[in-house]
Interface confidence: low
């Protein structure tokens, strides 16, 4: 499929001008290659009319130009003094006319309307409101006022001052007679339809002395704005329909066959299943404007989109609308990354997030998509060292492997972690990608004790058991903090006895904390990686308490699950007392509701949110 994109149809009137924008992937080759506009012949050839190399056909001399905008990946063809002879099929393209790097454009130039003298022309957008003003003389002030529409050769009554309303206009038309000082009556038609276009006649009085005024109503279907985005990227549709529909339900729909427009999302809570997890409808402003963000763009997302306002939350005749034609460029600069990542309860996932490598210094973010209230995506972690409180100790955003990819690790998975997550940066807004985390049946591969208590001044050894499937991976221990997980020295203790049917390639790797201090309290992770690519992780919380009895402390897997004060014997470990502590994540909701992104001067900031779920603290 050609990556060149432009308007499929361009309509204009004789004597007017058109401006046609064609989009291309802005690679260095494309930016500098020849751009052309040609007319398709009946036998299939395409005759150049204008090109970026300076050629202009005699047909276009003095009335057309072609301008390349290489930084945007667009070129624009302007054609003036249009005639009906310009109607036809054209191509805008790159390189050689016959090579196929082009887009078909249909240009339709129609005759201007033949209007009666003294005709007032009203040009109004579909779905909007028109006010037709009708002046009259004093002698007709008390006489019947009426508006007719010319249907073929005959005028058909639309509305009159005696109360008649044509059924086609029921509920959307009114006749206003101004105060005695003004010799004027007005007909207001709301929710304009394409079928409302045509010639109207307003009349005051019914005899030969009646006052008449001709009006021509043109109802414009909105020209779609062209939007050119990369596969796997994202698009934002900004929809501003005006304050008169501020309190009416809004929608975004995608045109399918014929006139059907399938709702993508609306403010009544409807959302198409194909967009689950990758769409946000931003709350509307007081003036009724709103925007819709779609991420993880797919080939099948290409097409014509309409946003509008109607109490049903879907397109109806007379809905005010805005239109876009979305082209999804398959020659995408956004690399492929997994759209689904699977993990098991108690296990972990490592998610790779792409970003624009030119923006390596941009701040990286990860957020959890929520479907409620038209979709939102509250932040969970960023590369500045902010982590949402409920995720402390089990979530980390790493700049590795770098060069266009960062990594997010989430462990201690539960079924509540299943859902859609967005990777984004504060740089290029188009690089927003979606990943779905699925929780599947199974056991975590890495085995570590539950929460562990260390004694001040003593030595603590914490085991991590790696099955043989990770024999070729680098194994590590690290201490979690808001900015990542700092690597710690660890010892390979030889094969692990924790796995059935696992040979000598299984491994027990221990973390040793010598002369434990209060600073050693916190979350520790063991994990596997290959170079800068991270695999599974497991987390252990180490609490530190005052010395009770001398000695060092080993922690076994069996004792990890022991009840408080229960004595447990495990081969290879000395008998110790295991003080179970409450998981610190359970305290998260009890922390002060404050965003402690502290400033240099020590001031504190707090957070308000539209959702009580956001009311956990956060740490820096």
């Amino acid at each position: 499929k050609s990556p060149i994109f432009g308007p499929e149809e361009v309509n204009s009137v004789e004597g007017n001008s058109v401006s046609i924008t064609c989009y291309y992937p802005p690679t260095s080759v494309n930016r500098h290659t020849r751009k052309y506009w040609c007319r398709q012949g009946a036998r299939g050839g395409c005759i150049t009319l204008i090109s970026s190399e300076g050629y202009v056909s005699s047909k276009y001399a003095g009335r057309a130009n072609l301008t390349n905008f290489p930084e945007n990946g667009t070129f624009v063809v302007n054609i003036a003094q249009l005639s009906q002879d310009d109607s036809g099929r054209y191509k805008c393209g790159l390189g050689i006319n016959s090579r196929g790097l082009s887009f078909d454009v249909s240009l339709e130039v129609s005759q201007g309307p033949g209007l009666l003298n003294d005709t007032k022309v009203y040009t109004v957008d579909l779905g909007r409101t028109v006010t037709i003003n009708c002046p009259f003389k004093t002698e007709n002030a008390q006489k019947r006022k009426s508006l007719y529409k010319q249907i073929g050769l005959y005028p058909v009554l639309v509305i009159d001052s005696s109360g008649y309303v044509n059924p086609n206009y029921t509920g959307r038309i009114r006749l206003d007679i101004q105060g005695t000082g003004q010799l004027l009556f007005s007909v207001v038609i709301n929710q304009l339809r394409l079928s409302d276009a045509g010639q109207y006649l307003c009349q005051a009085g019914d005899d030969s002395n009646s006052n008449k005024k001709n009006a021509d109503l043109q109802v414009l279907k909105p020209e779609p704005e062209l939007v050119y985005e990369d596969l796997r990227g994202s698009v934002t549709f900004h929809c501003a329909l005006g304050p008169e529909v501020a309190n009416v339900a809004k929608f975004l729909c995608r045109q399918s066959s014929g006139e059907n427009c399938d709702v993508v999302v609306n403010t009544l809570g409807k959302r198409a299943p194909a967009f689950e997890g990758r769409i946000l409808l931003n709350p509307q402003d007081k003036d009724g404007s709103f925007s819709v963000v779609i991420t993880g763009l797919r080939k099948e997302d290409a097409g014509r989109y309409l946003c509008g306002a109607h109490s049903d939350g879907q397109l109806q005749e007379g809905s005010p609308i805005q239109a876009w034609q979305l082209f999804v460029n398959e020659e995408s600069t956004i690399p492929r990354s997994p759209t689904v990542v699977k993990g098991v309860a108690g296990g972990s996932v490592a998610v790779l997030c792409p970003y624009n490598r030119k923006e390596s210094k941009s701040i990286k973010y990860w957020c959890l998509w929520e479907g409620a209230q038209n979709g939102r995506c509250p932040l969970l972690v960023d590369s500045e060292g902010w982590v949402k409180a409920q995720y402390e100790g089990r979530l980390s955003l790493l700049e590795e492997p770098g060069n266009g990819t960062f990594t997010v690790i989430l462990n201690q998975l539960t079924s509540r972690d299943a859902g859609f997550y967005w990777c984004l940066t504060n740089g290029d807004t188009l690089w927003r990608t979606t990943v779905e985390i699925k929780i599947i049946e199974g056991e975590p591969n890495l085995k570590v004790p539950g929460n562990v208590t260390a004694v001040l001044g003593e030595t603590l050894k914490v085991p991590c058991h790696f099955p043989c499937k990770f024999s070729s991976y680098e194994k590590y221990w690290c201490k979690w903090n808001n900015t990542g997980c700092q690597a710690l020295p660890s010892q390979d203790e030889g094969p692990s006895k924790a796995f059935v049917n696992c040979d000598e390639n299984s491994r027990l790797v221990s973390l040793t904390l010598n002369l434990v201090t209060r600073a050693d309290e916190g979350w520790y992770w063991c994990g596997v990686k290959q170079g800068h690519f991270y695999g599974e992780t497991a987390a252990v919380y180490v609490a530190v308490e005052e010395r009770k009895a001398a000695g060092s402390r080993d922690v076994s897997l069996a004792k990890a699950d022991a009840a408080p004060d229960e004595k447990v014997l495990d081969s290879g470990f000395r008998e110790i007392e295991n003080k179970a502590i409450q998981d610190p994540r359970l305290f998260a909701e009890e922390k002060a509701v404050a965003d402690t992104r502290d400033q240099a001067d020590g001031s504190r900031a707090s957070v308000d949110s539209g959702s009580s779920e956001e009311q956990g603290g956060s740490s820096r």
């Epitope: 900004h238 973010y365 939102r376 960023d382 504060n426 807004t429 992104r597 400033q599 949110s609």
Partner: nanobody
């Protein structure tokens, strides 16, 4: 490229109100978080308030909470700071900032800054 222009500053008495506006050019406005920072003479620039791109989250400096309200109008590409019950210690140059996805109090997520508007509160 986003450009930010603040307005609405001035000289007021303690206890009075002011409404600051920040007009942004650039159509990506509605996908960015916006924030207000302030800088008093001889002090570091300090965070005042921020609002997320979709207006679902607002952040405030503790000392202004309940007195200041941040809001935005994406259709008009404008962010506002309504300042009530002003105190002499609110005197500073107020800066509008933009360019982060998520509102926050650190200066680093904000790529774009206005020139500032002076607010002086006399006792």
């Amino acid at each position: 490229e986003v450009q930010l222009v603040e307005s609405g500053g001035g000289l007021v008495q303690a206890g009075d109100s002011l409404r600051l506006s920040c007009a942004a050019s650039g159509r990506t406005f509605s996908t960015y978080a916006m924030a207000w920072f302030r800088q008093a003479p001889g002090k570091d620039r300090e965070f005042v308030a921020a609002i997320s791109w979709s207006s679902d989250m607002t952040y405030y400096l503790d000392s202004v909470k309940g007195r200041f309200t941040i809001s935005r109008d994406n259709a008009k590409n404008t962010v506002f700071l309504q300042m009530n019950s002003l105190k002499p210690e609110d005197t500073a140059v107020y800066y509008c900032a933009s360019g982060a996805y998520y509102a926050g109090s650190s200066t680093s997520p904000y790529n774009y800054w206005g020139q500032g508007t002076q607010v002086t509160v006399s006792s």
